[in-house]
Each structure stands twice: as C-alpha cells, then as structure tokens.
Interface confidence: low
C-alpha cells in the first residue's frame, strides 16, 4: 500500500534571469527511493538515480544544476520556463509518487519570495 506523500514547493515565481530551486520531499513512507525524475511537461530535465547518480539532459545542461539534495536548480530563467514541473519518485516497494510544481517567470521585480524552499 502506498502511504507516502510528496510535499512540493507548490506554485512559485521568480524573476527573469534569476535562479530557482525546485524541491520535492517524500514523507510518511519507509520505501527506498531508487530514482527521482524531474520533468517539464513532456521533457526530461534530469534524473537522480540512487546507484548511478545524476544525469542532466543535454538540452538543459547549461541551465540546470543538480541539487540541493534531490532537488533541481534552474538558472538563467526565461519567460519560456513558465509552466508545470514534475518530480517523479520511483520507490521500492511502493511504486511511483508524483509531485507537481508550477513556476511563473516574471519580467519585472514583482516575484513573490514567500514560497517554501525558495531561494532569494
């Protein structure tokens, strides 16, 4: 039975040209995390595999940095980065847990900085 829950940064915003940390946290389960996938809509951004470590998609290697932890740092943000991001936790023996984050990249300096986990 899948008892775990995923806590995410939820809906966050950041300024164009800045950076943001996308973070998910799996709790309430003793399942072993074997892999975490980070995706933007239908594109794979990065994989963190328990045995093989991080793999950043070549399409994003200049703007995506692994961590902190199982999170993902997006750099040099553009307005086109606005959209849904998914953290997909592959666990054993529970199965798959998915979290959703919505990122809005703003042109001006009106980005909100109150979201949990968000870096200034």
């Amino acid at each position: 039975m899948m008892t775990g829950t995923i806590e995410t940064t939820g809906n966050i915003s950041a300024e164009k040209g800045g950076s943001i940390i996308l973070q998910c946290h799996l709790s309430s389960t003793t399942a072993q995390v074997t892999q975490v996938n980070w995706e933007q809509q239908d594109q794979l951004l990065a994989i963190c595999n328990a045995d093989l470590g991080w793999h950043i998609s070549p399409s994003f290697k200049d703007r995506v940095a692994p961590g902190p932890g199982l999170g993902l740092t997006l750099q040099s943000l553009t307005v086109n980065d606005t959209g849904e991001y998914f953290c997909i936790y592959h666990t054993y023996p529970d199965g798959t847990y998915t979290g959703r984050i919505f990122l809005e990249v703003l042109e001006s300096s009106v980005a909100e900085h109150g979201a949990r986990f968000q870096i200034p």
Epitope: E39, D42, I88, G95, T96
Partner: nanobody, 120 residues
C-alpha cells in the same frame, strides 16, 4: 489503459547472447525514461539499464560493456541486447517506462516480466 509487453527471454548457455524487446501500447501521450530491471529469486528488483528521453544511457557496473539498451521513440519500444551472459544474469527481466497519459498524469508502468536463464 497502458501496457508494456516484453519478449525475447529464454534459456542460453554462458557466454551466449539474448535480445529482449518491450513495446508500450495504449493511450500514451509521451514516454520519458525507459529501462530494464531484473529480479532473481529471493532478491530485490535491480536496475539493469536506463535510456532517457534524449537517448542517453546508464548502466550499473555489473552489466557495463556487456549489455546495450536502445529505444525507438516512434514505435514506443525499448530493447536490451545482452552479450557475454553469465549464470549470475539469471533472473526475471522487467521492462519499465515513465509514461504520461496526459499533461498532468505521469506514472511508471511495468511489464509482466520475461525469464532469462543462463546455464553454465
């Protein structure tokens, strides 16, 4: 409904080769990471090979140089070419795919497994 169907398993002598194939079918929006895992009797399911959406591959040391994973994004297939097989490779091999059936619906699907037996 999404299904993964493996084929290609069987009995082979040590030093021989096998090619496993897996096809994903059903209401598929997009497929992210695809992979192969294996499970020997009494042991946990272990990673064998991964291929990401951009074609990058990852292998654990135990199969590196002997196994090759490949995918066809048009046919929704993932293959595993296994060479220089050893008795320790005996296991049930499972196909795995991170499949999106809609913009917000992502989960990992597993095949039913195909038995590979390597005799000495």
């Amino acid at each position: 409904q999404v299904q993964l169907q493996e084929s290609g398993g069987g009995l082979v002598q040590a030093g021989g080769s096998l090619r496993l194939s897996c096809v994903a079918s059903g209401s598929i929006f997009s497929i992210g990471t695809m992979g192969w895992y294996r499970q020997a009797p009494g042991k946990q399911r272990d990673l064998v090979a991964l291929v990401t959406i951009d074609g990058s591959t990852n292998y654990p040391d135990s199969v590196k140089g002997r196994f090759t994973i490949s995918r066809d994004n048009v046919k929704n297939t993932v293959d595993l070419q296994m060479n220089s097989l050893e008795p320790e490779d005996t296991a049930v091999y499972y196909c795995n795919a991170n499949i999106r059936t809609g913009w917000s619906s992502v989960r990992t699907y597993w095949g039913q497994g195909t038995q590979v037996t390597v005799s000495s």
